[in-house]
């Protein structure tokens, strides 16, 4: 006859662990008992259970309430025990011995392997800025055992760099991803993946990125400037920019105060119907926690009699 | 060549026994056990009960009071027997050869009908 | 007793496609889980014992996989003789079966 069983079996930490021993014995052999111990290298053997063919289960002490027999219908060649509730203490060499008649003894050994899954955490780096160099934007660190894999899955481009710890039953193991920031990743997913064989599938933390920047301002309004002219109504100048956090915008005349009838909303500046005393130099002043810039533009508002006056002149001249 | 053959009647009386003889070959009883399943459009499969290399049964706990599993180890034959049958035991029979946790052979089947 | 539930109840799929049939246990069998192909007219045949290893003389197109309360059955590159029934079986207890996945050509 001979003995069935796995050389390995995976448990995940907490579930229960089949260790199986099947004997297949030649005609009429029978099994008597089915000896289960623990027999790590460098260790005496410790015995888990004892199943007697007549007396039935009997656990020893340290394994009481943890070794039990699989649920009838049982082959009586099947000395298979089950071992609840697996730690990682558990992780070791196994023996099943068993006493068959009239062959005598068989033995077969198997190893216990308690994965423990990971519980990952990603933790975001200091906070980016457009301008920076290589800066790191977040890591992620992922303990288990065996030692997880922990990559990154995202469209941003980037370098990674990955060390591991061992501890005397797991491996934690911590990836780092550095990144030249630019404006163009703002709220791009950053996604952490963390592979490990007590896991059923992959897990994923997802930071999305924030990158500070403030883009140079502009004024628009005044592309054509015959429209600037005295009378004119709904005159207005809009100030152009973007940035991360949201810029907050402020007018201001450099040559005077703002003249009266003048509405400041936000990014835009209304005009009153037009006088000659709108004419100016106008400040548009753009600013985030990051940075601030300023645009500025020349109003000039035409009289129109001025105006025709002046092309009659130059009819005349000609 | 292992096979296992199934010889029985194909129409049981409601309320009589339905006996059926499993003859092995290729592989010895002493080593193997035989289990019986049936299959009806109704109820699908159903294992039955099962009797192991050393003899000893055991039964599905719907069939324990009226299944009976035995065998004749020299002449490689398992005898199975239901009592008390009735019209939704309409099913076909099947012995199968044990493998650890599995029936890697099995008999040809035997239909059986209950009716009167 | 444990009960197992078997997916898809039938499905029809082409020579060369292929599939996957899924069972789940109600509680956990430790992988003491068969497999069993049965034709028309015909008894089961074992495919996969122990939920992973295949059973002599077939295919390595076919292959199982699980542990805990789910399994599942895949088979590769269909072939026309692969169309039948297929049942899931645990031995952790009294042993039961799924209720089966028709397979057929589409």
């Known amino acids: 006859g001979e003995l069935e069983t796995s050389d390995v079996v995976t448990v995940v930490l907490g579930q229960d662990a089949k260790l199986p021993c099947f004997y297949r014995g030649d005609s009429g052999e029978q099994v008597g008992q089915v000896a289960w111990a623990r027999v790590d290298a460098g260790e005496g053997a410790q015995e888990l259970a004892l199943l007697h063919s007549k007396y039935g289960l009997h656990v020893s002490p340290a394994y009481e309430g943890r070794v039990e027999q699989p649920p009838p219908p049982r082959n009586p060649l099947d000395g298979s025990v089950l071992l609840r509730n697996a730690v990682q203490a558990d992780e070791g060499e196994y023996e099943c011995r068993v006493s068959t008649f009239p062959a005598g003894s068989f033995q077969a050994r198997l190893r216990l392997r308690v994965l423990v899954p990971p519980l990952p955490s990603l933790n975001p780096g200091p906070a980016l800025e457009e301008g920076q160099g290589l800066t790191l934007a977040a890591s992620c660190t992922a303990e288990g055992s065996p030692a997880p894999s922990v990559t990154w899955d995202t469209e941003v481009k980037g370098t990674t760099s990955s060390r591991s710890f061992k501890h005397s039953r797991s491996a934690a193991v911590t990836s780092e991803f550095h990144l030249v920031p630019s404006r163009s990743m703002n709220g791009q997913p950053l996604t952490c993946v963390v592979s490990h064989p007590g896991l059923l599938q992959d897990q994923r933390i997802t930071h999305i990125l924030h990158v500070s920047f403030l883009a140079e301002a502009s004024v628009r309004g005044l592309e054509d400037q015959n429209l600037w002219h005295i009378g004119r109504e709904g005159a207005m100048l809009k100030c152009l920019s973007e940035g991360q956090p949201p810029p907050s915008y402020n007018w201001t005349r450099l040559d005077g105060p703002l003249p009266s009838g003048v509405r400041v909303d936000g990014d835009t500046l209304g005009f009153p119907p037009l006088t000659t005393e709108h004419s100016g130099i106008y400040v548009c002043h753009v600013s985030n926690e990051f940075s601030s810039r300023d645009s500025q533009v020349t109003v000039d508002v035409l009289d129109p009699q001025e105006d025709s006056g002046k092309q009659v002149d130059l009819v005349s001249a000609s | 060549q292992v096979q296992l053959k199934q010889s029985g009647p194909g129409l049981v009386q409601p309320s009589q026994s339905l006996s059926i003889t499993c003859t092995v070959s290729g592989f010895s009883l002493t080593n193997y056990g035989v289990h019986w399943v049936r299959q009806s459009p109704g109820k699908g499969l159903e294992w039955l009960g099962v009797i192991w290399s050393g003899g000893s049964t055991d039964y599905n706990a719907a069939f324990i009071s009226r299944l009976s599993i035995s065998k004749d180890t020299s002449k490689s034959q398992v005898f199975f027997k239901m009592n008390s049958l009735q019209a939704d035991d309409t099913a076909i029979y099947y012995c199968a050869r044990e493998l650890i946790h599995a029936m890697d052979n099995w008999g040809q089947g035997t239909s059986v009908t209950v009716s009167s | 007793d444990i009960q197992m539930t078997q997916s898809p109840a039938s499905l029809s799929v082409s020579v060369g496609e292929t599939v996957t049939i899924t069972c789940r246990a109600s509680e956990n069998i430790y992988s003491n889980l068969a497999w069993y192909q049965q034709k028309q007219g015909n008894s089961p045949q074992l495919l996969v014992f122990a939920a992973t290893n295949l059973a002599d003389g077939v295919p390595s197109r076919f292959s199982g996989s699980g542990s805990g309360t789910q399994y599942s059955l895949k088979i590769n590159s269909l072939q026309s003789e692969d169309f039948g029934t297929y049942y899931c079986?645990?031995?952790?207890?009294?042993?039961?079966f799924g209720g089966g996945t028709k397979l057929e050509i589409k």
């Open positions: 079986q645990h031995f952790w207890g009294t042993p039961t």
